[in-house]
Amino acid sequence: FKVATPYSLYVCPEGQNVTLTCRLLGPVDKGHDVTFYKTWYRSSRGEVQTCSERRPIRNLTFQDLHLHHGGHQAANTSHDLAQRHGLESASDHHGNFSITMRNLTLLDSGLYCCLVVEIRHHHSEHRVHGAMELQVQTGKDAPSNCVVYPSSSQDSENITAA
């Protein structure tokens, strides 16, 4: 499978909410022995590999924000901890995987990465990730609502080992 990032850039005004999205593409194994570990974290555009560095989102680590579920299930974070920080990650039946950030501030600007690990416990792991930029703006130049910029097809279907 691959991870697509439908949008590579989100430009939002301060105080707005935004939902960053990744999408699983291609065949997804729905066997009973297959589970998916999905999470989000902040990173920086490394010279060697984007998303190699894992930094917290609003002080929450990728482990705090992770989901795990079977291949055919939906899931979302019900952690009070995440919601207290204005965050919620979710995954649906159609391969969409998102994180919602509420009440954005300038400090939320940066590179965000989604990570998906397909796990056949004791057998195999397949990891892919996607990256997108969030720019939070303030003042007269800020948009009134979030503006999203589609990824090029090359970017959005790029498979990268995490």
């Epitope: 589970t35 482990q63 690990v117 416990h121 004791h122 195999s124």
Partner: antibody, heavy 112, light 111 residues
Framework: SLEESGGRLVTPGTPLTLTCTAS????????MGWVRQAPGKGLEWIGI?????NIYYASWAKGQFTISKTSTTVDLKITSPTTEDTATYFC??????????WGQGTLVTVSS | DIVMTQTPASVEAAVGGTVTIKCQAS???????LAWFQQKPGQPPKLLIY???TLASGVSSRFKGSGSGTEYTLTISGVQCDDAATYYC????????????FGGGTEVVVK
């Protein structure tokens, strides 16, 4: 069944390789883990090689141990043993949920 | 690092009584991959329970596992002399790299 071998008395810093030999099943179909137990102490997970060949180690074990696999054996190399590595070393088969089959263990003593 | 805390470290039980052992993980165990092992001196560990509550083949139904997330329990009912041993919990974690961890063990002494 599983049988560990290679345990012996070694001096600190002398590399040592332990071998786990399987009989009655194919190693290529299973994950294989290594666990150790110091005298009078509890079980301590060292690492595992899963079916695809990926190898994972406990954070404390990285650099100290190397796991490798052939068609008939799984090896654990202790790169530079210290007295703290004195223990019985077990290999165990990963059965998809946990470790369902264990060897009897082999004793490694590190002493100068 | 993952820490698995087992309590109590030692427990005394009368024949026919009940023993409860608790295992608490510092992070949520992945997909309920939590097992319990019994070990007697000079022997390798023996699997009792896997997936938190599934009894391993050939194991007495007097052993019962329960729990989810970070907290798990092993209950031994109708304790017998042969149950005298050390019991360990073992959990699997993906963070996101694979890690297994063992609890510190609980010694069960049967009176």
């Amino acid at each position: 069944s599983l049988e560990e071998s290679g345990g012996r008395l070694v001096t600190p810093g002398t590399p040592l390789t332990l071998t786990c030999t399987a009989s009655g099943f194919s190693l290529s179909s299973y994950a294989m883990g290594w666990v150790r137990q110091a005298p009078g102490k509890g079980l301590e997970w060292i690492g595992i090689i899963i079916v695809s060949g990926n190898i994972y180690y406990a954070s404390w074990a990285k650099g100290q141990f190397t796991i490798s696999k052939t068609s008939t054996t799984v090896d654990l190399k202790i790169t530079s043993p210290t007295t703290e590595d004195t223990a019985t070393y077990f290999c165990a088969r990963g059965d998809g949920y946990t470790y369902g089959l264990w060897g009897q263990g082999t004793l490694v003593t590190v002493s100068s | 690092d993952i820490v698995m805390t087992q309590t109590p470290a030692s427990v005394e039980a009368a024949v026919g009584g009940t023993v409860t052992i608790k295992c608490q993980a510092s992070q949520s165990v992945y997909s309920r991959y939590l097992a319990w092992f019994q070990q007697k001196p000079g022997q390798p560990p023996k699997l009792l329970i896997y997936s938190a509550s599934t009894l391993a083949s050939g194991v007495s139904s007097r052993f019962k596992g329960s729990g989810s997330g970070t907290e798990y329990t092993l209950t031994i009912s109708g304790v017998q002399c042969d149950d005298a041993a050390t019991y360990y919990c073992q959990g699997t974690f993906y963070i996101p790299d694979y890690i297994d961890g063992f609890g510190g063990g609980t010694e069960v002494v049967v009176k």
